[in-house]
């Protein structure tokens, strides 16, 4: 039975050219996290494996940095980065938990962070 929940940074706005940290946190479960995948739409951005550490997809290595923690830092943002991001927690014995973040990259200098929220 999957009892955990993923808390994410929620809905985020950021400035073009800036950077943003995407973070998820798995709670309410004692399951062991074996790997966390970060995806943008259907593209794999990065993997953090409990044994092997981080792997950044080659096409994103210039703009994606691992961390902090299991999070991911996106740099040199463009308006094309607007969209959904997913943190996919592979755990044992629970299985897979998925969190969702929606990022809007703004042309203006006004960018505010959305509220935190939970995904069951």
């Amino acid at each position: 039975m999957m009892t955990g929940t993923i808390e994410t940074t929620g809905n985020i706005s950021a400035e073009k050219g800036g950077s943003i940290i995407l973070q998820c946190h798995l709670s309410s479960t004692t399951a062991q996290v074996t790997q966390v995948n970060w995806e943008q739409q259907d593209q794999l951005l990065a993997i953090c494996n409990a044994d092997l550490g981080w792997h950044i997809s080659p096409s994103f290595k210039d703009r994606v940095a691992p961390g902090p923690g299991l999070g991911l830092t996106l740099q040199s943002l463009t308006v094309n980065d607007t969209g959904e991001y997913f943190c996919i927690y592979h755990t044992y014995p629970d299985g897979t938990y998925t969190g969702r973040i929606f990022l809007e990259v703004l042309e203006s200098s006004v960018a505010e962070h959305g509220a935190r929220f939970q995904i069951p």
Partner: nanobody
């Protein structure tokens, strides 16, 4: 409770166009992110397009980019999918889906709560 009813499906020749509609009943349509999905015979359901509650943000699967357009008319509680340059591989049952609220679009089926019964689109010469 949101109820979704798709229409507009049918048989069409390759290269032609078709417009699907999804009529929604329920008070929360104007705040509902929505999406179109499809399932071809013997294949898994796949995402086609998605749209935010206000239409500001849209998503398209790579296979339909440049050919399909998702839109909505909140005053009519209706979601649309304009399909141009249809191909044989677009043949499938098309479903619309909705959720009660949320920011941006939702491209993955797991986030949707409400589903229509589907409308069949057959692209054949």
């Amino acid at each position: 409770q949101v109820q979704l009813v798709e229409s507009g499906g049918g048989v069409v020749q390759p290269g032609r166009s078709l417009r699907l509609s999804c009529a929604a009943s329920g008070p929360s349509f104007s705040s509902s992110p929505m999406g179109w999905f499809r399932q071809a015979p013997g294949k898994e359901r796949e995402s086609v397009a998605a749209i935010s509650w206000d239409g500001r943000f849209t998503y398209y699967a790579d296979s339909v980019k440049g050919r399909f357009t998702i839109s909505r008319d909140n005053s009519k509680n209706t979601l649309y999918l304009q399909m141009n340059s249809l191909r044989a591989e677009d043949t499938a049952v098309y479903y619309c889906a909705a959720r009660d609220s949320g920011s941006g679009y939702y491209s993955r089926a797991q986030w949707y709560v409400y589903w229509g019964q589907g409308t069949l689109v057959t692209v054949s010469s």
